[in-house]
């Protein structure tokens, strides 16, 4: 899987948008790691 | 209204350093990363690195590792690139950009500084 | 590095014209690609991303398809405003790359 901070920035805007933006506020591409996915 | 302002054009001597701004707005800066991308006259873009504002890690195209240095003033919500022994060749347009989630899902870019360096 | 090849480099078309440019990877990058228009004096301005979705606010006469080494950018009707030059960008290895160009000129 992508891990360059393009792909987790796009992998965590689906998230978002799938979850309704309804996760933690400190969910955001600079504090995920790939880990997250 | 997200914004990433750059600084003014610039005109260096060979083998001198330049420091080029990224003034950002309208977002929270420590939560995306920053990119660098230049462009020749005429020529491709070319990515140079990025940066975590959040912790400060970087990643750079090998082609300008150590000579190209990416920071970040939290505080002013600024990102900076810096390039050392500049020579004929890093005449170019500099641009930097951060892929944005909210408030708006977007791909912003900064409007560019020129770099030109001539003895 | 990974290689773009961007074709053609240039193409003249009119207003209402089907445009195809097409980009191909020297390996697999999945679909991290995205695509920019650029005008001249201007930043590039990001049209799409993940190979096939579109940016909000962008015209849905752009589509971009693939997945792998190959990759599409169609504008399906060339708008006045469209004439420009199209770069594609993997975005899957460090370093990002970018495909050469293409020149999209009036006929």
């Known amino acids: 899987s992508c891990n360059t901070a393009t792909c987790v920035t796009h992998r965590l805007a689906g998230l978002l948008s799938r979850s309704g933006g309804v996760v933690k506020d400190n969910f955001v591409p600079t504090n995920v790691g790939s880990e997250a996915f | 209204e997200v914004q990433l302002v750059q600084s003014g054009a610039e005109v260096k001597k060979p083998g001198a350093s330049v420091k080029v701004s990224c003034k950002a707005s309208?977002?929270?800066?420590?939560?995306?990363?920053m990119n660098w991308v230049r462009q020749a006259p005429g020529q491709r873009l070319e990515w140079i690195g990025d940066i975590n504002p959040n912790t400060g890690g970087t990643n750079y195209n090998q082609k300008f590792k150590g000579r190209a240095t990416l920071t970040v003033d939290k505080s002013a919500s600024t990102a900076y690139m810096e390039l050392s022994s500049l020579r004929s060749e890093d005449t170019a347009v500099y641009y930097c950009?951060?892929?944005?989630?909210?408030?708006?899902?977007?791909?912003?870019w900064g409007q560019g500084t020129t770099v030109t360096v001539s003895s | 590095d990974i290689q773009m090849t961007q074709s053609p480099s240039s193409l003249s078309a009119s207003v209402g014209d089907r445009v195809t440019i097409t980009c191909k990877a020297s390996q697999n990058v999945d679909t991290n690609v995205a695509w920019f228009q650029q005008k001249p004096g201007k930043a590039p301005k990001s049209l799409i991303y993940s190979a096939s979705y579109r940016y909000s606010g962008v015209p849905s006469r752009f589509s971009g398809s693939g997945s792998g080494t190959d990759f599409t950018l169609t504008i399906s009707s060339l708008q006045p405003e469209d004439f420009a030059t199209y770069y594609c960008q993997q975005y899957n290895n460090y370093p990002y790359t970018f495909g050469g160009g293409t020149k999209v000129e009036i006929k």
């Open positions: 309208g977002y929270t800066f420590t939560d995306y990363y």
């Open positions: 950009a951060s892929i944005i989630i909210v408030p708006n899902y977007f791909d912003y």
